[in-house]
């Protein structure tokens, strides 16, 4: 029961996290114009990984894509790569984890195979989350560096009364979405890895219990589970005794539909 709950919760948390990573990657507000200590402008600038936007006070917003690859800063390219790797790994992890869920029956898939898949998806979620956190952190670091550089020469105009105020950028909403989403994916991955330990067959030494039936004796031995150090092919998990109670394995649940807009 606890294993199924941990696995299910890990899946849901990872699903939310990956949806968040996708959202953050697509968002335009990775960096936003710093309004603190700046003259109030009738124009608001913000930038994403794929395009930069300008919102005028008049309500008109104009966005321009970065139609160059070679002209973009290496750091931005690195952030894009990290986020995409995170999304791809997360998506594969989700696919794998769907088949690994205890509540979903696929043919005669053994628990050891499900344990393997759970661990694989967990590791994928952990790496996905780390990629997202790393990507967002690299971008944040880039912003901080640029912020202090532009603060150092805030007013670039020389001579006379003419001044050019440099636009400074600060953390946008996408960074916080990315950090939270990366963290959730990471937590989900850890939960999947924990669930994997419970799914893995263990070698436990139970004493055989004798049940005396009328006329002849039948000995029922509880099936052993191999320890989670490895998933050998020598473990055949046959149901040896079923007391008639409906186990968690048999409870059917339907995966909920998560629409990402």
């Amino acid at each position: 029961m606890a294993v199924t709950a941990c696995q299910g919760l890990g899946f849901v948390v990872s699903l939310i996290g990956i949806a968040g990573i996708i959202a953050a990657t697509c968002m335009d507000q990775w960096s936003t114009q710093d309004l603190y200590n700046n003259p109030v402008t009738a124009v608001f600038n913000y930038q994403g990984l794929w395009r930069s936007c300008v919102r005028e006070s008049s309500g008109f917003t104009e966005c321009r894509g970065y139609f160059t690859l070679l002209g973009l800063p290496a750091m931005l390219q690195a952030v894009r790569a990290l986020m995409i790797v995170g999304i791809v790994l997360g998506a594969i992890g989700l696919l794998v984890s769907i088949f690994a869920l205890k509540c979903i029956r696929i043919g005669s898939m053994e628990d050891s195979a499900k344990a393997n898949m759970t661990l694989t998806s967990g590791i994928m979620f952990i790496v996905s989350g780390l990629c997202a956190i790393a990507g967002v952190s690299v971008f944040a670091n880039m912003l901080v560096t640029n912020f202090w550089m532009s603060t150092a020469n805030m007013y670039t105009g020389m001579g006379g009364m003419v001044q050019t105020v440099q636009t400074r950028y600060t953390f946008g909403a996408a960074l916080f979405v990315g950090w939270v989403a990366g963290g959730l994916t990471l937590i989900g991955g850890v939960m999947m890895c924990i669930a994997c330990r419970g799914l893995a067959p263990e070698e436990t030494n139970y004493k055989a219990v004798s049940y005396h039936a009328s006329g002849h004796s039948v000995a029922y031995k509880p099936g052993g589970f191999k320890a989670s150090t490895g998933f050998g092919s020598n473990t055949k998990n046959k149901k040896i005794y079923d007391g008639g109670a409906r186990t968690e394995d048999e409870v059917q649940s339907y995966p909920s539909k998560h629409d990402y807009v």
Epitope: Q33, A42, V43, E56, Q166, T167
Partner: antibody, heavy 118, light 113 residues
Framework: QVQLKQSGAELVKPGASLKLSCKAS????????INWVRQRPEQGLEWIGW????????MYNEKFKGTATLTADKSSSTAYMQLSGLTSEDSAVYFC???????????WGQGTLVTVSA | DIVMTQSPSSLTVTAGEKVTMSCKSS????????????LTWYQQKPGQPPKLLIY???TRESGVPDRFTGSGSGTDFTLTISSVQAEDLAVYYC?????????FGAGTKLEIK
């Protein structure tokens, strides 16, 4: 076509209050901001502030913050400017104008002449 | 507040002549985000409200004759009328559309001989 129709001329006493109206037609009223501009006799233009009828967001010129209050009524597609504590310095033509690309003012009302005199 | 300085304050020309008027702002009106200058030009004829001529320093509003051209960047801007017509008799205002409060120049009065 887009039209901004302003209320008629007003003659008020110093210290009095006044509410000017600007009725919009020919476009979606809630989508575009309405600006108010003052022009004193033989002088230039002064921006008072703007209101976005959609969410009633306002922005004022600090100079007019105590004097002008901008409101809008979506049901009648009308923007209003309440002027309080009027002095002879406030005698001017007041225009309303629709916000446009580049924060420019594209369509203007015909103007309301306000005379503050004892 | 941003100070908009227009020059000359008035000029008298004959029909068909080319006219240029200047507008200087106390701070740059260039937005780095889209590389656009937030400067607007208006024409106000006697007894009428102002009329939008040019926004983003050089974009002509639809319906405005192509004899009107806006140019310049940063702090220095120019409005050029390639061949003045009698109906161009008006006061021309430039406006800072970048910083709050939005401010206007004192205007350039164009008179026809």
């Amino acid at each position: 076509q887009v039209q901004l129709k302003q209320s008629g001329a007003e003659l008020v006493k110093p210290g009095a209050s006044l509410k000017l109206s600007c009725k919009a037609s020919g476009y979606t009223f809630t989508t575009y901001g309405i600006n108010w501009v003052r022009q004193r006799p033989e002088q230039g233009l002064e921006w008072i502030g703007w209101i976005f009828p959609g969410d009633a967001t306002t922005m004022y010129n600090e100079k007019f913050k105590g004097t002008a209050t901008l409101t809008a009524d979506k049901s009648s597609s009308t923007a209003y400017m309440q002027l309080s504590g009027l002095t002879s310095e406030d005698s001017a033509v007041y225009f309303c104008a629709r916000f446009y690309y580049g924060n420019s003012f594209v369509d203007w009302g015909q103007g309301t002449l306000v005379t503050v005199s004892a | 507040d941003i100070v908009m300085t227009q020059s000359p304050s008035s000029l008298t020309v004959t029909a068909g002549e080319k006219v240029t008027m200047s507008c200087k702002s106390s701070q740059s009106l260039l937005n780095s985000g889209n590389q656009k200058n937030y400067l607007t030009w208006y024409q106000q004829k006697p007894g009428q409200p102002p009329k939008l001529l040019i926004y983003w320093a050089s974009t002509r509003e639809s319906g405005v004759p192509d004899r009107f051209t806006g140019s310049g960047s940063g702090t220095d801007f120019t409005l050029t009328i390639s061949s003045v017509q009698a109906e161009d008799l008006a006061v021309y205002y430039c406006q800072n559309a970048y910083y709050y409060p939005l401010t206007f120049g004192a205007g350039t009065k164009l008179e026809i001989k």
